[in-house]
Interface confidence: low
């Protein structure tokens, strides 16, 4: 019998309110044994797959997706999904990235530390269980 895959979680470092031009890193977490993590935009066909998965704890694995210089176009909802053979997980909750026009730099106190979305309610839109772990040629750690 196939195991039920736990839903991934998503968080953003240093937070979800990021000054224009600063960096943000999305952290996707799931169980051990994950082959591919995917960070995707809401219903948007641009997404980023990575197989650069590290063990965050004895029971958790994670992947990190970095945007070096955030622009207005990076604002919006993000979520994670992972592939643990032989199937894809459900999606994480959405995490909303806000881009703030400010003179503050990457370490500005305007950023909200430790924002995350854990495995609570299931989003109502498209299931990704049909997905094959096909990379779109986007580089992990450099989403856009």
């Amino acid at each position: 019998q196939e195991e039920d895959l736990p839903r991934p979680s998503i968080s953003a470092e240093p937070g979800t309110v990021i000054p224009l031009g600063s960096h943000v890193t999305f952290v996707c977490r799931g169980p051990v044994g994950v082959q591919t993590f995917r960070l995707e935009r809401e219903s948007r066909s641009t997404y980023n797959d990575t197989e650069d998965v590290s063990q965050a704890s004895p029971s958790e694995s994670e992947a990190r997706f970095r945007i070096d210089s955030v622009s207005e176009g990076n604002a919006g909802p993000y979520r994670c999904i992972y592939y643990k053979p032989p199937k894809w997980s459900e999606q994480s909750d959405y995490l909303e990235l806000l881009v703030k026009e400010t003179s503050g730099g990457p370490d500005s106190p305007d950023t909200e530390p430790g924002s995350s979305a854990g495995p609570t309610q299931r989003p109502s839109d498209n299931s990704h269980n049909e997905h094959a772990p096909a990379s779109q040629g986007l580089k992990a750690e450099h989403l856009y």
Partner: antibody
Framework: EQSVEESGGRLVTPGTPLTLTCTVS????????MCWVRQAPGKGLEYIGI?????STGYANWAKGRFTVSKASNTVDLKISSPTTEDTATYFC??????????????WGPGTLVTISS | ELDMTQTPASVSEPVGGTVTIKCQAS??????LAWYQQKPGQRPKLLIY???TLASGVPSRFKGSGSGTDFTLTISDLECADAASYYC????????????FGGGTEVEIK
């Protein structure tokens, strides 16, 4: 040569389910997103939905529940579950440029005409 | 919800003239905008993507500009063959939209 061609357009009565097929050649559906777009007579282009390489789908708000996009190895289908006269249009299948939505749609079929009339 | 407004609905200019078509997004889309040309009875043709990048085989008379919410397609040195409808398309979201295309602009060559 890379090409996209729609088929299945015909005259049907309102409420009769209809499936249109887009056949692609010269490239792989495992590398490209594919869209369906329609155009009513004398009107503009109207986006219906998209299918991603992994098989998941996205739809315009108005199209959700009315249309279903699916695919096989070299075909992409559009099912109209219960057509009305307002669904009369030419239906186009289009490939997303360089496999990424931000690049627009670079390869279009000639379209297939669907007429819904009683 | 992201909507696209295109103006004017129609325009008429002489051969050799210049046409300017504007497209406005209801929210910022960066440079994620495409332009298409469609002649009567034909399929649409991609002209420009990423707001200003010419698609393969498109002459440099076609120029796209703009970012954020306001975009422009300029066609200079107009030729008879440029008579067509032109559409903008937001290339930012593929979901949670009613339509990704603007309403279109019909260009007539005098």
């Amino acid at each position: 040569e890379q090409s996209v061609e729609e088929s299945g357009g015909r005259l049907v009565t309102p409420g009769t389910p209809l499936t249109l097929t887009c056949t692609v050649s010269g490239f792989s559906l495992s590398s490209f997103h594919m869209c369906w777009v329609r155009q009513a007579p004398g009107k503009g282009l109207e986006y219906i939905g998209i299918i991603y390489p992994g098989g998941s789908t996205g739809y315009a708000n108005w199209a959700k529940g009315r249309f279903t996009v699916s695919k096989a190895s070299n075909t992409v289908d559009l099912k109209i579950s219960s057509p009305t006269t307002e669904d009369t249009a030419t239906y186009f299948c289009a490939r997303v440029n360089y496999g990424d939505w931000i690049n627009g749609m670079d390869l279009w079929g000639p379209g297939t005409l669907v007429t819904i009339s009683s | 919800e992201l909507d696209m407004t295109q103006t004017p609905a129609s325009v008429s200019e002489p051969v050799g003239g210049t046409v300017t078509i504007k497209c406005q997004a209801s929210q910022s889309i960066g440079s994620n905008l495409a332009w298409y040309q469609q002649k009567p009875g034909q399929r649409p043709k991609l002209l420009i993507y990423k707001a200003s990048t010419l698609a393969s085989g498109v002459p440099s008379r076609f120029k796209g500009s703009g970012s954020g919410t306001d975009f422009t397609l300029t066609i200079s040195d107009l030729e008879c063959a440029d008579a067509a409808s032109y559409y903008c398309q937001q290339a930012y979201w593929s979901g949670n939209v009613d339509n990704v295309f603007g309403g279109g602009t019909e260009v007539e060559i005098k």
